[in-house]
């Protein structure tokens, strides 16, 4: 969480941003809130990206003002216009690109004053893993697959029964480049699996951490997975 003032002079308002990550090819949100104003026409929102010539987005007098927008963001940005009046200046970024990573500034002007806060935005690819029993294998084997990751993640297996055990000798992980030549499909195979045990396939890079669990008993198979974005700090 980053809370910014940083405006010289007397009248400053509080602006708050949250560091976040974007999944390339999907839509992302750059979060920013501020002390609201009574009149929408008095609110100006400017989004800037450090090092970029034009603005990322500008909203003033109740509508988008995109004449100064940098071409790398053309047609890809929107604020939540109906929520500006209550202090939401968050930006929706469509079709996130790797090059969208960087430091952004949410700059607010209202009748009460001015304020800004910076936001670190990371970009990459992350997806939920699915763990299945590989019935084609000669021994009891688990197969963990996740369709899109970037940068290349690490894959670690763990088990509930053998806590702390190192499965690197009995597992094999491969990364297959997807058709767009950036993201990769992650496949990890775990051999010599025992029944009545819960196994976890943990995939992690500097943007996200995802876990796929599987519990194999003689009567059923239970699966669960979750994904967590790393470094979501507010400013």
């Amino acid at each position: 969480l980053i809370i910014g003032f940083g405006i010289s002079g007397r009248h400053s308002i509080t602006v708050t941003t949250v560091a976040s990550a974007g999944n390339i090819g999907e839509d992302g949100i750059l979060s920013c809130t501020f002390e609201p104003d009574i009149k929408l026409s008095d609110i100006v929102i400017q989004w800037l990206k450090e090092g970029v010539l034009g603005l990322v987005h500008e909203f003033k007098e109740g509508k988008d003002e995109l004449s100064e927008q940098d071409e790398m963001f053309r047609g890809r940005t929107a604020v939540f216009a109906d929520q500006v009046i209550v202090g939401n200046a968050s930006l929706r970024l469509k079709n996130v690109q790797l090059t969208d990573a960087g430091t952004y500034k949410c700059y607010i002007i209202t009748s009460k004053g001015k304020g800004n806060a910076n936001l670190e935005y990371k970009t990459g690819a992350f997806s939920m893993p699915e763990v299945n029993v590989d019935y084609n294998a000669s021994s009891e084997t688990l197969r963990c697959e996740a369709p899109r990751w970037f940068p290349q993640p690490t894959v670690v297996w763990a088990s509930q029964v053998d806590q702390g055990a190192n499965f690197s000798e009995v597992s094999n992980t491969s990364f297959e480049l997807n058709s767009e030549n950036v993201t990769m499909k992650v496949v990890s195979v775990l051999y010599n699996v025992t029944i009545n045990n819960t196994y976890s396939c943990m995939i992690e890079n500097d943007i996200a951490k995802a876990t796929g669990d599987i519990k194999v008993t003689e009567s059923e198979i239970k699966r669960r997975s979750h994904l967590q974005l790393l470094n979501s700090k507010a400013s």
């Epitope: 002079g9 100006v44 400017q46 800037l48 450090e50 090092g51 970029v52 090059t99 700059y107 002007i109």
Partner: antibody, heavy 117, light 107 residues
Framework: EVQLLESGGGLVKPGGSLRLSCAAS????????MHWVRQAPGKGLEWVAV????????YYADSVKGRFTISRDDSKNTLYLQMNSLKTEDTAVYYC??????????WGQGTLVTVSS | DIQMTQSPSSLSASVGDRVTITCRAS??????LNWYQQKPGKAPKLLIY???SLQGGVPSRFSGSGSGTDFTLTISSLQPEDFATYYC?????????FGGGTKVEIK
């Protein structure tokens, strides 16, 4: 430490050419638009040219358009200014500057270009 | 092109004085205005960006205000190291343009 270091200045005759370099260090050069700004002896600041972070856009002051070319080599973290058909009025200290939040936030120490016969 | 007019072109002041420099744009530039300080033989240094945002490491005695066409740089209490030339610069459209400068001298 974030740093910009210009080189390549010197004495050149009118109509001659010169290439200025600006070596960047301490930051991710490829993420920033970069500018050249000049200052004639005893005069104010004059913006010369800019190149976008990815090199796709370049803009020039009217006074140098068609004669100067701005370029960058991200693999070498270096900005360039190729100056052709130099005139006496191009005599100045040339600064490279990083584009931060809509401003020149980091400047080099400058390199002197003298155009004289 | 957008013309930037700074006034005064020079001023004499004493340590501790409050100093105000103004900058006028020939057309509306919103808040897209920056202020720089330059000392003899040195490169300029960014003080204020986006009209009123203080650049990191710049003392809080410097402040900027204004929007549209009229802008002000204020030094609340002039220090010996503040004697220099100050420039405003518009950042809304190419070509980027600077004001003519204001030289702050010791009285």
């Amino acid at each position: 430490e974030v740093q910009l270091l210009e080189s390549g200045g010197g004495l050149v005759k009118p109509g001659g050419s010169l290439r200025l370099s600006c070596a960047a260090s301490g930051f991710t050069f490829s993420s920033y638009a970069m500018h050249w700004v000049r200052q004639a002896p005893g005069k104010g600041l004059e913006w010369v040219a800019v190149i976008s972070y990815d090199g796709s856009n370049k803009y020039y002051a009217d006074s140098v358009k068609g004669r100067f070319t701005i370029s960058r080599d991200d693999s070498k973290n270096t900005l360039y200014l190729q100056m052709n058909s130099l005139k006496t009025e191009d005599t100045a200290v040339y600064y490279c500057a990083r584009h931060g939040w809509d401003a020149f936030d980091i400047w080099g120490q400058g390199t002197l270009v003298t155009v004289s016969s | 092109d957008i013309q930037m007019t700074q006034s005064p072109s020079s001023l004499s002041a004493s340590v501790g004085d409050r100093v105000t420099i103004t900058c006028r744009a020939s057309q509306d530039i919103s808040n897209r205005l920056n202020w720089y300080q330059q000392k003899p033989g040195k490169a300029p240094k960014l003080l204020i960006y986006l009209a009123s945002s203080l650049q990191g490491g710049v003392p809080s005695r410097f402040s900027g205000s204004g929007s549209g066409t009229d802008f002000t740089l204020t030094i609340s209490s002039l220090q010996p190291e503040d004697f220099a030339t100050y420039y405003c610069q518009q950042a809304i459209s190419f070509p980027l343009t600077f004001g003519g400068g204001t030289k702050v001298e010791i009285k």
